[in-house]
């Protein structure tokens, strides 16, 4: 479901990983140097910037974030 | 320097009504959300509820709705809390605080209700 | 309503202690959890944000961590200016809810 406007709840921010606000919506998402093997699962819509240098992801399939814009 | 600058302390009759405003400066208004943050004596924090000034669409917690009503006036930069046929129980300091993309970065100073008879 | 249990409830440390304090949430809240102090007769202050982001101003000897369910506030080498009350909040759903506090007192 979507999320319900409100200014004091917290964009999605994936385990272990370090989000930082980027506007009035918007989150950049920090998940470099985490030894990940796979895109984290749960990344919000809402998210602007993803780092994910330094994991260990041998690739990506089509498409791999169909949730954002 | 962000800045919320709440009315001074109140002292109402059980039944009466209030209004606590909250003047910010040093950004701009429309941009952030309003929260309110009310303590009881001794007690932990508890949220009220929050508006969105640029078009005072609000949220409020379920034990809040009905008695506490949340208002902006954008002319003058300031949100306010009213809360209507008060009770003993109201008392409180009650905190507004600024909000953006989920956390509540600056906070007023506090104002304290007391309901007595 | 998300419920958050704070431990301890207060807590005596001495200047130079390492102190953590902890935050247990009813249900998963996904890293959406912020830390404040509160100083008597003071505003309130964001301390961190997003589980383990430091706000601005706020010394790097306050560290936040955890996931899932459970998170901690951890200081590394308490000063005189951290004895205070600490609160953790939830931001995953509304109504967002805090901790009860942790005063943090002078042993």
């Known amino acids: 479901g979507s999320s319900p406007r409100s200014g004091v709840l917290l964009r999605g921010c994936p385990t272990h990983c370090h989000c930082e606000p980027d506007g009035r919506m918007l989150l950049r998402v920090d998940c470099s140097d985490l030894g990940l093997s796979e895109l984290p699962s749960n990344l919000s819509v809402f998210t602007s910037y993803l780092d994910l240098s330094m994991n260990n992801i041998s690739q990506l399939l089509p498409n791999p974030l169909p949730s954002l814009r | 320097q962000v800045q919320l600058v709440q009315s001074g302390s109140e002292l109402k009759k059980p039944g009466a009504s209030v209004k606590v405003s909250c003047k910010a400066s040093g950004y701009t208004f429309t941009n952030y959300w309003m929260q309110w943050v009310r303590q009881a004596p001794g007690q932990g924090l508890e949220w009220i509820g929050e508006?969105?000034?640029?078009?005072?669409?609000?949220n409020y917690n379920q034990g809040f709705t009905g008695r506490f009503v949340l208002s902006v006036d954008t002319s003058v930069s300031t949100a306010y809390l009213q809360i209507s046929s008060l009770k003993a129980e109201d008392t409180a300091v009650y905190y507004c605080?600024?909000?953006?993309?989920?956390?509540?970065?600056?906070w007023g100073q506090g104002t304290t209700v007391t309901v007595s008879s | 309503d998300i419920q958050m249990t704070q431990s301890p409830s207060s807590l005596s440390a001495s200047v130079g202690d390492r102190v953590t304090i902890t935050c247990r949430a009813s249900q998963d809240i996904s890293n959406r959890l912020n830390w404040y102090q509160q100083k008597p007769g003071k505003a309130v202050k964001l301390l961190i944000s997003y589980r383990s982001r430091l706000h601005s101003g706020v010394p790097s000897r306050f560290s936040g961590s955890g996931s899932g369910t459970d998170y901690t506030l951890t200081i590394s080498s308490l000063q005189p200016e951290d004895f205070a009350t600490y609160y953790c909040?939830?931001?995953?759903?509304?109504?967002?809810?805090f901790g009860g506090g942790t005063k943090l007192e002078i042993k």
């Open positions: 605080a600024r909000s953006l993309s989920g956390y509540v970065d600056y």
């Open positions: 909040q939830q931001g995953n759903s509304l109504p967002p809810t």
């Open positions: 508006i969105d000034p640029s078009d005072s669409y609000t």
